[in-house]
Amino acid sequence: LRPSRVYKPEGNTKRALTLKDILNGTFSYKTYFPNWISEQEYLHQSEDDNIVFYNIETRESYIILSNSTMKSVNATDYGLSPDRQFVYLESDYSKLWRYSYTATYYIYDLQNGEFVRGYELPRPIQYLCWSPVGSKLAYVYQNNIYLKQRPGDPPFQITYTGRENRIFNGIPDWVYEEEMLATKYALWWSPDGKFLAYVEFNDSDIPIIAYSYYGDGQYPRTINIPYPKAGAKNPVVRVFIVDTTYPHHVGPMEVPVPEMIASSDYYFSWLTWVSSERVCLQWLKRVQNVSVLSICDFREDWHAWECPKNQEHVEESRTGWAGGFFVSTPAFSQDATSYYKIFSDKDGYKHIHYIKDTVENAIQITSGKWEAIYIFRVTQDSLFYSSNEFEGYPGRRNIYRISIGNSPPSKKCVTCHLRKERCQYYTASFSYKAKYYALVCYGPGLPISTLHDGRTDQEIQVLEENKELENSLRNIQLPKVEIKKLKDGGLTFWYKMILPPQFDRSKKYPLLIQVYGGPCSQSVKSVFAVNWITYLASKEGIVIALVDGRGTAFQGDKFLHAVYRKLGVYEVEDQLTAVRKFIEMGFIDEERIAIWGWSYGGYVSSLALASGTGLFKCGIAVAPVSSWEYYASIYSERFMGLPTKDDNLEHYKNSTVMARAEYFRNVDYLLIHGTADDNVHFQNSAQIAKALVNAQVDFQAMWYSDQNHGISSGRSQNHLYTHMTHFLKQCFSLSD
């Protein structure tokens, strides 16, 4: 047996992080996002749960809704009606999937200072929102959409087709929620509140995933979810628009699907209102390399929405799939005709384009060997966007302003030089027409949120600077974080290395690779974090590395689309390449290298362990995908095509973890999964375990009863990280 090695950080003034610190969330940070209610006014929920109104220009602030009112119904969230007469209070939050939840809603009348009685809302509600003007309410209850002209009125029932696990109106089914919309809702008000657009998802023919939920009863419950796996029948989707001014005078009007899309299986991908009587729908072929953006207009004389062919814009990828993770959405100009959109340029970098008539005639607005990430706001004279251009670091985000009123348009980086060392990764929140905006910096230093003037970009005030966190970290020995790149052949890989305090290049350290590696993901980001791997570096003296290999985002399509139709190959190869490079650096103990990952990262870590290279002593896979046939159609097929003989079945079969069961013989493998994982089904780990048993390969496993993909209940999470820590320390011969 190798003697145990104990890592002792030197210097006694500061203490190392403990696992308890991480599990208790002792060093979590705060951000401040204003809830904008006008060009210069916003709301914010205070620490003590008062809802406070702020006017930037008059400097006025007052409590609009007291914490006692919130407490009276146990409210955890709120929403002010645009006419400022009512507030909805949300309570009894009950999580469903990643974004979806149900809740009880109460309407509080700010004028009268009392709750609205009469025609109270049913419970639990699946989604509720105010119209953009006035105080109309749209809500979804039992998969049907209802409308109230005012909170105290009886509702109009807009849809009647809703049925549990069959037909969903105004809310997505499982696969659309997780893989397409990334929202809990599928309804959108027109800007003036006249129309309400919504999607109907018909899941009647979708196969059901069923799993046991053990609970406390004598018999387990069975959870049934319509869940299309790769190649299975998909939801049938239709988009309708209802005139909410006269809901019984005109029924919901269906929006036609573009012919080139409707000719085979397709997806709805997003809806954007352009003006009060113009809407933009985005559609995607099931083979997700063709996207169509369709602009439709209301024809009052026909009571119909017309989507002329000359208002269809096609986006196609010849090297992979359309878009990044999702197809980007358009940001329309004031003229309600032209728009700005991010898509790949001729060099394969995602950039902002201006489309006036056809995509072919698009004018490229940004260019370079970097990528535009997101368009925040388009005003009369400015376009605000984020990119990773600055200093050539793909893992940074800065906010830029293009003055589109000028000819030629001029570009300015709003954030690049604000707090250069502390802040390299920003997002922003703009008031309606960008008169003011908040910047939220996520790191690499302590996060800070600030308020700015939209015309001059001047900082007006600091909204949150995490002073308490700064103070509590003063006596903590934090590891050193480096973000660098390594080259191999013609490829460049960015990596983040977390080095133990008092790191000494002349010594040898155990190495843990943390991997995600999914298509269009990014792990190497200039953000602040104090988490499990921070603790491992700080207290246990482990070097941590994260590497963005091929298939990861924001470095051009050549790098991104390298994994198209062959998942599980280059992602793994690039992690192995990086490990070899790290060994060459001289401070890694080759005998003590591990890899771990969750979800897609669990898949990659499993394949890396089974690569037969002998690089890894041990590794952990949490909730891994084990075969792309077991995962959701929209995701799997986006990157792998269909699991059919005439398409890509061969690689679906070749890329499973099970196919490599024999290769786990010489590594220590810890396999972990929640039994109530609605996303990456327990089936994935069950099949890995079965294959390992059949191959007579020893391994360790842990399941978490009734836990989902996040294994996030307090007790389970504590157990999980404690268990993984023990496993790693044992693997690295670190004493407890």
Epitope: Q149, F156, Q157, Y160, T245, H248, H249, E300
Partner: antibody, heavy 125, light 107 residues
Framework: QMQLVQSGAEVKKPGASVTVSCRAS????????IHWVRQAPGQGFQWMGW????????HHAQDFQGRVAMTRDMSTDTVYMELTSLRSDDTAVYYC??????????????????WGQGTLVTVSS | DIQMTQSPSSVSASVGDRVTITCRAS??????LAWYQQKPGKAPKLLIY???SLQSGVPSRFSGSGSGTDFTLTISSLQPEDFATYYC?????????FGQGTKVEIK
């Protein structure tokens, strides 16, 4: 007082067309939808469609697709309903009725509060 | 489309009786229901809107109740002029639909 006055009875042959008028008085004509409803002998009511006099926009029931046309004349505060390709089962009393909800506001249904006296249309060969 | 079903189709009653007519919607319509009275050879007259609101000028012996799918029109004390046919109408969703009618006759 508010009233709707309809044109007189009509006898038509199958395949022909009929136009029924409905003149409004005693209120602001543009502010209220006018609906057309028919009642076959000894039967209940069948809703046919509506016109928004303010905009001239119409909408009708699926059953009358392509056969019914509703128009209005703002100068005389009159709406017209034309039914084409008449069949014997179109024999009925045709009513115009005012919708109490306002065309200019978010919709609340208060009912059809003012009705015309009815126009008997007989379709017979 | 939503169907409206009234019951009974006819009722015989005497002056002073309490008469109840029910109307059932094939799907929920909240409170978007109106009641009409029609006498032979005449146009209908609006009695009740929004399920329970009395139209102005209508005697208070008429009342409406219900929400969702089940609704009731009650005449608390039948008067000679109340002998007529009564119709319900839904206005929750397109197209508006009427019940088939309930005839109140003299016993």
């Amino acid at each position: 007082q508010m009233q709707l006055v309809q044109s007189g009875a009509e006898v038509k042959k199958p395949g022909a067309s009929v136009t029924v008028s409905c003149r409004a008085s005693g209120y602001s004509f543009a502010d209220h939808f006018i609906h057309w409803v028919r009642q076959a002998p000894g039967q209940g009511f069948q809703w046919m469609g509506w016109i928004n006099p303010n905009r001239g926009v119409t909408h009708h029931a699926q059953d009358f697709q392509g056969r019914v046309a509703m128009t209005r004349d703002m100068s005389t505060d009159t709406v017209y309903m034309e039914l084409t390709s008449l069949r014997s089962d179109d024999t009925a009393v045709y009513y115009c009725a005012r919708d109490e909800s306002l065309t200019a506001r978010p919709y609340y249904f208060y009912g059809f509060d003012v009705w015309g006296q009815g126009t008997l249309v007989t379709v017979s060969s | 489309d939503i169907q409206m079903t009234q019951s009974p189709s006819s009722v015989s009653a005497s002056v002073g009786d309490r008469v109840t007519i029910t109307c059932r919607a094939s799907q929920g319509i909240s409170s978007w229901l109106a009641w009409y009275q029609q006498k032979p050879g005449k146009a209908p007259k609006l009695l009740i809107y929004a399920a329970s609101s009395l139209q102005s000028g209508v005697p208070s012996r008429f009342s409406g109740s219900g929400s969702g799918t089940d609704f009731t029109l009650t005449i608390s004390s039948l008067q000679p002029e109340d002998f007529a046919t009564y119709y319900c109408q839904q206005a929750n969703s397109f197209p508006p639909a009427f019940g088939q009618g309930t005839k109140v006759e003299i016993k």
